[in-house]
Each structure stands twice: as C-alpha cells, then as structure tokens.
Interface confidence: low
C-alpha cells in the first residue's frame, strides 16, 4: 500500500462538516434540528446574552484543558532525593517554641548538585511522613522568603489515620526560585490553619524526624523517613540537545496555520451554521472555528533502521510508541451556543468542539 | 478498500514492541543501549531502591493524568445563573460587624429550579466582581455547614488591580451538597486569610453588591454585577437517556481486558525487557504492562443516514467529530526505571509509557 496517495482536502472537509452536524445534534440529544415556528421576533433578551457572555468568559479565562507537554517533558527525568538539613543544625534554634508550626530547612547547594540549572527542574515534591493521629486538622505549607516573611504554597485537610502515611506537596516553583538565587539555607513552614476566630491554633499533626517530643520513638530516626525533596530533572548533558536545531513543535494554530507542514498538523476550518449546515436555529454564535487534524505520522522504527537517525524524530512523530500512530486532536475547547426550544431561549455549553492543536498518538 | 480485513495481532504487537524500543532509547537520548561492562556485581544499593520506590509511590499516589470524561460530560450543558439573595434580607443582619469576612447567601429553591437533581449538576461557579484595589491580599472561601460551622473550600492571592475584575471559584461540591439537602438558605463566607501571628486580619478586598460602604457607589447595584452562581447542568429530559441501555463505556483495562470488544479498546501487552527487547541494561523493573490501542472507530455520519439511529453511537465512536476517527491512548502513566551509566546507578522517570485506556479521536 502506498502511503503517498493524494489527500482530497475537500472531501476531508466535507466529512468533518457532516461529522460536526451529527456531533452537535448528538450532544443536544436531538434527533433533528428544533422547529423555529414559535421563536419570538427581535434580538435575544439581554439576560440571555449576559449569560452567554458569562459562559464565553469562562472559556476564555480558565480553560481546564491540559497544555500540550513542552518538548522537555517527553524526555526521561533523572530522579534524586535531597534530605532535610539535620535537626541539630543551629538554624532550627529560633523555631523551637512555636506551637502552630514546624520547620524544614534544605541546603540549596545539595539541590544544585542534583539540578545544576533552574530550567532543568521538571518537578519537585516535598515528602513528609505523618505519624498516626486521631484528630482531623487543616494544615498549610509556606515557603521561606528572604526578608524573613513566608509565602503561602498550599493546604491539605488531614483526616485521622491509624498508620504513618506519606504526604506529598508540589514545591516545584519554590525550588526553582531557590535555584535562581545563590546557595544557602532555604526552608518550608508546615503550619496549622489559623482561623480568624479560633483560639486553639496548635499544630496537632506530627511529622517523622521533626516533631520534637517524638524524636526518639522509633529509635534513631531512619534517614529514609525524615522529610526530603523528591526531584525530577532533565540531566545537564541531555539538556544541551534541547537547544539544538531539531525542536519538537507544538502542532497548534500558531505554527500550523502559518506553515506548509505536510505531516500531522491542525488545519483551518470555519463552520458557518447557515452556509455549511443549512441551520438557522442556532442564534449565537453564527459559526465557529472547528478546525481538524490531518497529515501523516510516519511509523519510524524497524529493526534495520539506524538508531541514531531515527531517535530525533521519535519525539515528533511517534512519542507514544504506537504501532500505527495517528494524527488526532490534543487541545480542545468548548463552544457555548444559544438556541430556542419553543419560545424559550437556552444557553448550552458543548464540550470539546474546537480543535486548538494536534498530536501524533 | 474493505475495512473488514483481518488484523494480524502478532504483527501489531511486534510493531508496538519495536516502537517501544525506540521510545525508551529516545527518551533517554541514547543512540544505543549503554554498555554494561563496569556495572558492579550484586544487588542495587538500598538508597537507589528507596529512590525508585519513592518514584513508584508517586505514580500510584497522585497520577496527574486527567480522568477519562464521564459519559455525561459529552452531552451539552444548560447554563443558568442564580443571583445572591438580596442584601436587604434579614439573614445578613448577624454578619454586619465582622471585619474579616463578607457573606453571600443563596436560596436552594432557586438552584433547584435550574438543577432538579444533584447528579445533573456538571459545574457550579461562584462569580464575584471585585472592585479596584491597591492592596495585595490572601483570601479564602468557606461553605456554610448546618451547625453554624464553616467548611474551607479554597483560597486565592489577589494582587492590586486598577479596574473591577471577576473572580471565579469552583463550588460544584458545595452546591451539589445543598441540592442533596432540603430547601433553605445556604451561604458562602469570603474571608481574609488569618495568619497565626498577624494581628491585622481585616478583609481589604471589596466585592460589588456586598461591601457595605461601597453600596451606592455605582448608583443602584446593577443585578448583573452582584455575586451569582453560574450553573452548568444536564437538562432533566436529556438525563433520562443516560440511564438507558446504550452507555458510553470507559475503554479502559477493566472493561477491555474482560470483554471481547471488536471496536476500539485497550489491548493487553506486557513487555519483558530481556525476552522482548533483548535488553539486560534496565535493572528495575524487569518489564511493564505497556498495552496498546486497537480496533475500528467507524465513521458514522452521512447525509443519507437516518439521524436518530446514528446519534446514540456518536458518543462512543466519534465524539470529536473527526473526518476519520482513530483509536488512540487516552489515559497514560509514567514508568520509573533504574539503569547504570558506567558504575553509577540512575533512577529515571519516563513519561506516558503505560496505556491505561483508549478513545476514538
């Protein structure tokens, strides 16, 4: 079978348009377009338009779709662990008698040993082993700032537990910030959530290797169980390649609409409800940029292929190591519409209607 | 071309295995497997195993991959807005002189009007218009609980702004809970984040339609700008279908491994590094369940097809309205590995290696 057959672009567009006809009706669970007999004349009511706009704002403001992974995310991440500075260190002295918080300090030079440059860091987690506890408590994590202030990072509601359990906090931003500074001691504060009214702001949660009164309860605290940072980073030697010529492109509208890419890419397609589907029943919008994915994803591996030539192509053409990679949507966005059911205008949101980028999968 | 040709399953598996060979080397940026000449004899060092296990724990504990969308998410959502109970209502009396918080109450019967049954609610957002402000403040949102207590919902760091701006909080869980209870007035509390040490716990952020001293600064507060709930829900009549016989299945290992599904599904494939790839250089794990996607996604729309027959199939076979839908991975998981570079053991995490579920895209 030749893979070089010409693509009839018009046929593909026609098929996509007809598929969209079915998709919209199916999402609305309509067997056919609704009758427009009772639709009142004149423009849409102001309240309906306001509601439609609110829905559009949401789409613009906080699309929950995952971003396409950056090139570096495709490659393997080296995993290392950096233990908290030992509790005997003088830096802990000032924090001794504070009942609402416990502190964990880390040496930036240890972190830099594992992650020589900030952009190489892919993920950093703070791992704490919480001892068994019979109380529920809302806790917060803060990052130490230079001028002795603390920046809020996140919170967790901890329910009672009969056994020790590991907690994990994503502290990638904080660690990347430390790496952007010189070396030194940096830290986290793990606190009770102090409410505006409550008088009891004591931290009841105990952390292995920190909580002072439990210091000896497991004999010498085993290093493996004291707080540590779990770091995932692109090794320095691997990072050099990321700045070489062969980049993994985002196959999105920015790139695809302005290039003559023959391989997998997002292709422009505007659907005009009246012209393309012969529909007058959707009152807003008049149409939308549906787009579609098209183009080959060459299968680029066989036993007789020379390894080194092929490896650089993997990231773009077959990152998921599929037996027959396929050009499919990656980032999708919803579409709000306004239509009438009888005399009643409805605002509805249709999920995954607009193709923003494609990928070989 | 006949789409009924028999699939040579062994050939597909072979292609997937060879693709994985390239994928792993490419992710590690290796042109060929590393030499094992200097690898020290004996088991892996304990610290390396502990690190490998930490990485595996992370994968088990908090995979960041999005869940496959439930069937209901495919269908259109009706959008409605429910305004906050008017500030003149007696319920606000008790909350007048509290400086750290402002309160917003909603009538559950108004919400139920829009969402007659809790499971129909897809998303609820609390929208507040914040007035211009020159201060930065960390704020929190709480949900009213029956016994006059408050449950923490979320927080936001608000930076200074020269113009009014809309804030949006996801309150789906809270609203669903209210719908599960009887009718009545329910509310949210919007508070300053009260720190354990700080004495100034005053809320400096002002919300249009609430903050008392600004009550008249825009003339009569325009209804459109007072706090409201933006609700997205499956209409009742559409929901009946979700309980009918034809479900959209999750094409995951639970379903696919135990069925004889001919169409798109995840297929079982265990890769043994030694047997399948002839590799001895990966020390942990010995192999992994890579799996793969296979099976047709029939294109199910044409002008002469009878609408109603086809609509029910859309959700399963071509939810993205593709011109040529394709069976591709949906949920993927990473794989941590241990291997040696010279005498040095390395723990690395490879992204998107294990196929957990598939979809037609």
């Amino acid at each position: 079978l030749s893979t070089c057959k010409t693509i009839d672009m018009e046929l593909v567009k026609r098929k996509r348009i007809e598929a969209i006809r079915g998709q919209i009706l199916s999402k609305l669970r309509l067997a056919s377009p609704p009758s427009q007999g009772e639709v009142p004349p004149g423009p849409l009511p102001e309240a309906v338009l306001a509601l439609y706009n609110s829905t559009r704002d949401r789409v613009a403001g906080e699309s929950a779709d995952p971003e396409p992974e950056p090139e570096a995310d495709y490659y393997a991440k080296e995993v290392t662990r950096v233990l908290m500075v030992d509790r005997n260190n003088a830096i802990y002295e000032k924090t001794k008698d504070i009942s609402h918080s416990i502190y964990m300090f880390f040496n930036t030079s240890d972190i830099r040993e594992a992650v020589p440059e900030p952009p190489l860091l892919s993920r950093a987690e703070l791992r704490l082993q919480r001892l068994k506890s019979s109380v529920e408590q809302h806790v917060e994590l803060y990052q130490k700032y230079s001028n002795n202030s603390w920046r809020y990072l996140g919170n967790r509601l901890l329910t009672p537990t009969d056994t020790p359990e590991w907690l994990s906090f994503d502290v990638t931003g904080a660690v990347r910030q430390w790496l952007n500074q010189g070396d030194g001691i940096q830290g986290f504060r793990f606190s009770a959530h102090c409410s505006c009214d409550s008088k009891d702001n004591k931290l009841h949660v105990e952390i292995n290797g920190i909580s002072p009164k439990r210091r000896g309860d497991l004999g010498t605290i085993h290093d493996m169980n004291r707080p540590f940072l779990l770091l995932m980073a692109t090794p320095l030697e691997r990072a050099q390649h990321l700045h070489s010529s062969r980049h993994r492109r985002a196959l999105d509208t920015n790139y695809c609409f302005s290039s003559t890419e023959k391989n997998c890419c997002v292709r422009q397609l505007y659907i005009d409800f009246r012209k393309d589907l012969g529909w007058k029943w959707i009152h807003e919008p008049k149409g939308y940029h549906a787009n579609f994915c098209l183009g080959p994803c060459p299968y680029i591996w066989s036993l007789d292929t020379q390894y080194s030539k092929v490896l650089a192509l993997y990231n773009q053409h077959n990152p998921g190591a599929s037996a027959s990679p396929c050009c499919v949507p990656q980032a999708l966005e919803p579409l709000p519409i306004v239509y009438y059911v009888g005399r009643k205008p409805k605002v509805e949101q249709l999920s995954n209607m607009i193709v923003r980028s494609c990928k070989c999968s | 071309l006949s789409t009924c040709k028999t699939i040579d399953m062994e050939l597909v598996k072979r292609k997937r295995i060879e693709a994985i060979r390239g994928q792993i080397l490419s992710k590690l940026r290796l042109a060929s497997p590393p030499s094992q000449g200097e690898v020290p004899p004996g088991p892996l060092p304990e610290a390396v195993l502990a690190l490998y296990n930490s990485t595996r724990d992370r994968v088990a504990g908090e995979s960041a991959d999005p869940e496959p969308e439930p069937e209901a998410d495919y269908y259109a959502k009706e959008v409605t807005r429910v305004l906050m109970v008017d500030r003149n209502n007696a319920i606000y009396e008790k909350t007048k002189d509290i400086s750290h918080s402002i309160y917003m109450f909603f009538n559950t019967s108004d919400i139920r009007e829009a969402v007659p049954e809790p499971p129909l609610l897809s998303r609820a957002e609390l929208r507040l218009q914040r007035l211009k402000s020159s201060v930065e403040q960390h704020v929190e949102l709480y949900q009213k609980y029956s016994n006059n207590s408050w449950r923490y919902l979320g927080n936001r760091l608000l930076t200074p702004t020269d113009t009014p701006e809309w804030l949006s909080f996801d309150v789906t869980g809270a609203v669903r809970q209210w719908l599960n209870q009887g009718d009545g007035i329910q509310g949210f509390r919007f508070s300053a984040h009260c720190s354990c040490d700080s004495k100034d716990n005053k809320l400096h952020v002002e919300i249009n339609g609430i903050s008392p001293k600004r009550r008249g600064d825009l003339g009569t507060i325009h209804d459109m700008n007072r706090p409201f709930l933006l609700l997205m829900a499956t209409p009742l009549e559409r929901a009946q279908h979700l309980h009918s016989s034809r479900h959209r299945r999750a094409l995951d290992t639970n379903y696919c491994f135990s069925s004889t599904e001919k169409n798109c599904c995840v297929r079982q494939l265990y890769i043994d590094f030694r047997k399948d790839l002839g590799w001895k250089w990966i020390h942990e794990p010995k192999g992994y369940h890579a799996n793969f996607c296979l099976g047709p996604c029939p294109y199910i729309w044409s002008l002469d097809t009878q609408y109603s027959k086809v609509l029910a199939l859309y959700n399963q076979h071509n939810p993205g309205a593709s011109a040529s839908p394709c069976c591709v991975p949906q949920a993927l998981e990473p794989l941590p590995i241990v291997y040696y570079v010279g005498r040095k053991p390395k723990v690395e995490q490879l992204s998107n290696m294990i196929v957990r579920s598939c979809k037609c895209s």
Partner: antibody, heavy 120, light 112 residues
Framework: EVQLVESGGGLVQPGGSLRLSCAAS????????VHWVRQAPGKGLEWVSH????????YYADAVKGRFTMSRDNGKNTLYLQMNGLKSEDTAVYYC?????????????WGQGTQVTVSS | LPVLTQLSSMSGSPGQTVTITCTGS?????????LSWYQQLPGTAPKLLIY???NRASGVPNRFSGSKSGNLASLTITGLQAEDEADYYC????????????FGGGTKLTVL
C-alpha cells in the same frame, strides 16, 4: 592549569558596540557557570552578568540589562559579552571569572582583564 | 551605595592581626548565601581567598581565615606581612536584588 584570557576591549564612542571574548582552558568549560565582573578606574568591583553551564540561564545587573548579552560556545570553550548602546559609565576593566562549583557565585579563577573605554 | 558595607581603609604593622568586616542583611549574608573574600594586589586581577564564609581557597596561607555571624562577615589576617597590602572585597549573592550578586565597596589595607 586553569586559564581565562579576555580580549576585544578598546576605545568606542557612546552608543557604539563592542564584543568581548574570554577563552578558557585547563578545566571542563561546559561544567561551570561563568561571570563578567568589571572595575571602573579607581573604583570597586561590580558584578555584570552570569551564564550557567549549559547556557540555559543568563542573569544581568540592572545597569546593563537590555544592552548587554552574554553567550557561550562550549565547543570552542569561549565566553562572549556583546555590549551595545555603550555609555561613558561602562568604562572599566572587564574580567571574566569562573564559578568554584557549578553556579555558586564564588569566583576561583579570573582573567587578567580587558580595558573598555567609552568616550567621544 | 554598596549593599555590603566595608570600611574603606585600614592599616596595621607587620606581625599584627587585623580584622576586616563586611556588614550585610538577611537577604544576603544573613540569608545563608555563599560569602566570599577576594584579594586584589595593585595592578592585578582579584584572587579568591575565602569561599563559603570560612573555607580557605587552595594555595591561600592559613594566616587568612573567615567567619560569619548573623549579618556580619569577617576576614582575619594574623601575622600581617608586607605582601598583604592590597584591596580586599567581600562578595555575596543577594536575593532581594534583581541584580543577584553584590560586592562590598572594598577595604584598602596598608601595611605600615
């Protein structure tokens, strides 16, 4: 023996450009962050810029931000400082210096310096 | 004005002990960042004497020592010699500045 040798200095008019180079030898250049530090006549030391080992991260003093660009060629073991829009206050001896470890901002080896004079 | 403060000049006789100080803040010295001391002999490039506040660089005589307490760092020279006459600079990373690194104004040490 570690050696850093600067070149490319000279006399230039205000608004003009110069490109300084620093040739490194005696150590694995691609493993270390490197910095430019300058010293105006009769004045103290002033940090100018830093580039990390792989050339991924670059940092500049406020006084030169937007005008100076630091780069490196690890294949040629050479560091560069492209200086545009020069001002009279940029007149100084420019030193390149290497980090003691990775990006520690401790300079264990310095070049002999190259003189840059900005004058009309 | 330099963020790290040093006395502009000091003097001492041969054999004496002198201490040069460098005062900073919690965003540099007090923040635990690497602090270094450099010696610049007349007409030459600077040379690293002390790194990480109290470690002697290779080849530096043990007459030179460094210490740090809070926001204050000190360089002590015991048994002062004529060849120690030079400018001495402290340097440290500063997290509050976008510039990143700062040097003290320098101390001119004269051996009488």
């Amino acid at each position: 023996e570690v050696q850093l040798v600067e070149s490319g200095g000279g006399l230039v008019q205000p608004g003009g450009s110069l490109r300084l180079s620093c040739a490194a030898s005696g150590f694995t250049f691609s493993n270390y962050g490197v910095h430019w530090v300058r010293q105006a006549p009769g004045k103290g030391l002033e940090w100018v810029s830093h580039i990390s080992a792989a050339g991924i991260s670059r940092y500049y003093a406020d006084a030169v931000k937007g005008r100076f660009t630091m780069s490196r060629d690890n294949g040629k073991n050479t560091l560069y400082l492209q200086m545009n829009g020069l001002k009279s206050e940029d007149t100084a001896v420019y030193y390149c210096a290497k980090d003691r470890i990775r990006s520690s901002y401790e300079y264990d080896s310095w070049g002999q310096g190259t003189q840059v004079t900005v004058s009309s | 004005l330099p963020v790290l403060t040093q006395l502009s000049s000091m003097s001492g006789s041969p054999g004496q002990t002198v201490t040069i100080t460098c005062t900073g803040s919690s965003s540099n010295i007090g923040g635990g960042y690497y602090l270094s001391w450099y010696q610049q002999l007349p007409g030459t490039a600077p040379k690293l004497l002390i790194y990480n506040a109290n470690n002697r660089a290779s080849g530096v005589p043990n007459r030179f020592s460094g210490s740090k307490s809070g926001n204050l760092a000190s360089l002590t020279i015991t048994g002062l010699q004529a060849e120690d006459e030079a400018d001495y600079y402290c340097g440290c990373y500063d997290s509050s500045l976008s510039t990143g690194y700062v040097f003290g104004g320098g101390t001119k040490l004269t051996v009488l």
